[in-house]
């Protein structure tokens, strides 16, 4: 789950579960910083605006990132 705060990492738990790119409203990738030493990936779902913290090390999530970036590159001129 994500918690909003000004310091430390945002994600309290992370999920390995694959997410359907079509059901994604937004995908935030937060790089490591002075507050949090690792990458954080927060998916906002279209349904109810539900959010999930995703495990950047998970194969399913790596595949999701590839699919999303491929989709983006298709859209950009």
């Amino acid at each position: 789950i994500p918690l909003s705060r000004t310091v430390r990492c945002t994600c309290i738990s992370i999920s390995n579960q694959p997410v359907n790119p079509r059901s994604l409203e937004k995908l935030e990738i937060i790089p490591p910083s002075q507050f949090c030493p690792h990458v954080e990936i927060i998916a906002t779902m279209k349904k109810k605006g539900e959010k999930r913290c995703l495990n950047p090390e998970s194969k399913a999530i790596k595949n999701l990132l590839k699919a999303v970036s491929k989709e983006r590159s298709k859209r950009s001129p």
Epitope: I1, L3, I12, S13, S15, N16, K48, E50, K51
Partner: antibody, heavy 121, light 109 residues
């Protein structure tokens, strides 16, 4: 199956210390935030502390801040609660619980059976 | 800190009847952050409802949750003998503490 087993409870004098443990199995412990929740005899549930999956984030109830420390060892699939300067009002059943990782906040979906701490002189 | 109030304190009903339990927050709670738990004597709590209205895995459909803002409701459409227990609501705001309500005891009339 998914399981949490607490241990380390007992009878302790006021001002002394105790360390509770919670052994996790059947799920990816290193992905899950973990909570301690307590219940005084005949009373309701009181949230005590939370630690993030990676041990970076720690949060405490005001009633235990500065006295209790939550920690975890992901290599051992174990959660801990170090309780110092214990008071009579800390007497309770202490539960560890898993923070459901599949959503924004889906509650505490797995609970241990609890371990009893009695603070008495 | 958000304070949760549950009413009634005790609800005396017969099996087959409908139970309506209320949880009121001292300030607005995102519905994503409201959960309900059931606890029977000598047992650990069990998650029933999350996100104010979604049933947790394995929870029968006679349990339903509703509400938003400061007012939330847990409804048990037809009480089964195993439903007599204490029910707690819990909020999980954008930062701790993650408070529980004081509980509602549903007992047999």
């Amino acid at each position: 199956q998914v399981q949490l087993v607490e241990s380390g409870g007992g009878v302790v004098q006021p001002g002394r210390s105790l360390r509770l443990s919670c052994a996790a199995s059947g799920f990816t412990f290193s992905n899950s935030g973990m909570h301690w929740v307590r219940q005084a005899p005949g009373k309701g549930l009181e949230w005590v502390a939370l630690i993030g999956f990676d041990g970076i984030n720690e949060y405490y109830a005001d009633s235990v801040k500065g006295r209790f420390t939550i920690s975890r060892d992901n290599s051992k699939n174990t959660l801990y609660l170090q309780m110092n300067s214990l008071r009579a009002e800390d007497t309770a059943v202490y539960y560890c619980a898993r923070d459901w990782p599949e959503g924004y906040y889906n509650g505490m979906d797995v609970w241990g059976q609890g371990t009893t701490v009695t603070v008495s002189s | 800190e958000i304070v949760l109030t549950q009413s009634p304190g005790t609800l005396s009903l017969s099996p087959g009847e409908r139970a309506t339990l209320s949880c009121r927050a001292s300030q607005s709670v995102s519905s994503s952050y409201l959960a309900w738990y059931q606890q029977k004597p000598g047992q650990a709590p069990r998650l029933l409802i999350y996100g104010a209205s979604s049933r947790a895995t394995g929870i029968p459909d006679r349990f339903s949750g509703s509400g938003s803002g400061t007012d939330f409701t847990l409804t048990i459409s037809r009480l089964e003998p195993e439903d007599f227990a204490v029910y707690y609501c819990q909020q999980y705001g954008s930062s701790p503490p993650f408070t529980f309500g004081p509980g509602t005891k549903v007992d047999i009339k």
